[in-house]
């Protein structure tokens, strides 16, 4: 997260880190005791999932292995559409005040809605600085019409844009797959953005979760 702030401790109990060994690979969101939602471009053969801590690499955090993941069948590495994936944990999480599932959306929030994005991604760009603490940024949803002025044909119908006019605050490497939460519901998953990160008036681009609720529910049901 560029130009963000340290999240209030325990305020994001659904936030997970997908680790490759001990190294941050992507963010993710707990949606069920067995399931983590993340970006399809974060796919690996297996994952070490850290839950229940705002500190990356926290020894006291829950760490659960995951060996199965299900990309959206329509994910395209060419157009980056349908950048969403479910990761099935090998064992259920122990729910607590520090570990909770996020609320999936009942509807799509409109442009102008205030939201918070979080992650352990680099706080500087192009040189990388990975924080140990979970970082947050407060952003507002931007209309597709406005966002298309910046990204033109790269912006797909199920992509959501967010940012703050003239501000550098945004997502970056390592934040991918992490949550954009608006009015206590998951509205977006970090998908992509301009590099170097933090260029004013280049919004962050997210997978619009409200358009995928049926797929999420059906996939979890199929692979119970």
């Amino acid at each position: 997260i560029i130009d963000g702030y340290k999240c209030k401790e325990g305020s994001h109990p659904w936030q997970v880190a997908l680790l490759k060994g001990n190294q941050l690979h992507c963010g993710g969101v707990l949606v069920d005791k067995y399931w983590v939602l993340t970006a399809a471009h974060c796919k690996m053969g297996q994952y070490q999932v850290q839950l229940g801590s705002d500190k990356i690499g926290d020894q006291s955090a829950q760490k659960i292995k995951a060996t199965k993941s299900f990309r959206h069948p329509g994910y395209s590495t060419k157009t980056h559409v349908n950048d969403i994936m479910l990761v099935r944990l090998d064992e259920p999480v122990k729910m607590s005040s520090k570990v909770e599932a996020v609320q999936l959306p009942e509807h799509c929030e409109p442009p102008g809605t205030s939201c918070t994005v979080s992650g352990w991604g680099t706080t500087t760009s192009p040189d990388v600085t990975f924080p140990s603490d979970l970082m947050c940024s407060d952003v507002k949803l931007i209309s597709s019409r406005e966002c298309k002025k910046v990204y033109k044909d790269l912006l797909g119908k199920t992509m959501l844009c967010a940012g703050i006019p003239d501000s550098k605050t945004n997502t970056c490497n390592g934040d991918s797959g992490g949550p954009l939460v608006c009015n206590d519901t998951l509205q977006g998953l970090v998908s992509w953005g301009t590099y170097p990160c933090g260029q004013p008036n280049d919004p962050g681009v997210y997978t619009q979760v409200c358009k995928y609720k049926r797929w999420v529910m059906e996939t979890m049901k199929t692979h119970r």
Partner: antibody, heavy 128, light 108 residues
Framework: QLQLQESGPGLVKPSETLSLTCTVS??????????WGWIRQPPGKGLEWIGS???????YYNPSLKSRVTISVDTSKNQFSLKLSSVTAADTAVYYC????????????????????WGKGTTVTVSS | DIQMTQSPSTLSASVGDRVTITCRAS??????LAWYQQKPGKAPKLLIY???SLESGVPSRFSGSGSGTEFTLTISSLQPDDFATYYC??????????FGGGTKVEIK
């Protein structure tokens, strides 16, 4: 200041495998922001992209060479390597390693990068 | 694959001249074009990326323009150090990165 240096044999026999290594100094290859690529230039000719690799090991190859190319990365040594099998005289060229600077991060990153830092190049001749 | 066609292949000019090199893509590449300068026996050096963004440390006499399929590299006032071969490269497609055939700028 980032520097790249190619190394490997200058002479390779036809049908054998060409192996080159690029050593990166002045910066870490494991920065998740960048791609690391190989480009070649036959004598008196233009530039041809061979392929690239990300710090995590995701590879992208030129389809015309894909069946013969392997690019790998060794983050512990701050190096990445090229292997080109079944070489012929047509593979004689100056081989450059280079860093790919992305225009986007995340899902869109690997299609939009340009080579911003290059090695000096190493000449490889394929001859018996 | 996207083909990149540069013109002219050779250009004779004098110090102080305004020089223009054109690069055409076989299909639209938006603004995903870079320009490189290469001197004999040396590696290419990045001049311009994203069609018109000047790489850090490159003199302001170099400029790039264009989008879609037609692009231009302009040297506003040619200096002795500018005699070299120039290549364009497209990096905005799902096919491989491809370079133009090069334009050699030589002394008139």
């Amino acid at each position: 200041q980032l520097q790249l240096q190619e190394s490997g044999p200058g002479l390779v026999k036809p049908s054998e495998t060409l192996s080159l290594t690029c050593t990166v100094s002045g910066g870490s290859i494991s920065s998740s922001s960048y791609y690391w690529g190989w480009i070649r230039q036959p004598p008196g000719k233009g530039l041809e992209w061979i392929g690239s690799i990300s710090y995590s090991g995701s590879t992208y190859y030129n389809p015309s060479l894909k069946s013969r190319v392997t690019i790998s990365v060794d983050t512990s040594k701050n190096q990445f390597s090229l292997k080109l099998s079944s070489v012929t005289a047509a593979d004689t060229a100056v081989y450059y390693c280079a860093r790919g600077a992305p225009t986007y991060f995340g899902a869109a990153s690997h299609y939009y990068y340009y080579m911003d830092v290059w090695g000096k190049g190493t000449t490889v001749t394929v001859s018996s | 694959d996207i083909q990149m066609t540069q013109s002219p292949s050779t250009l004779s000019a004098s110090v102080g001249d305004r020089v223009t090199i054109t690069c055409r893509a076989s299909q639209s590449i938006s603004s995903w074009l870079a320009w490189y300068q290469q001197k004999p026996g040396k590696a290419p050096k990045l001049l311009i990326y994203k069609a018109s963004s000047l790489e850090s440390g490159v003199p302001s006499r170099f400029s790039g323009s264009g989008s879609g399929t037609e692009f231009t590299l302009t040297i506003s006032s040619l200096q002795p150090d500018d005699f070299a071969t120039y290549y364009c490269e497209q990096y905005g497609s799902y096919s491989p990165l491809t370079f133009g055939g090069g334009t050699k700028v030589e002394i008139k």
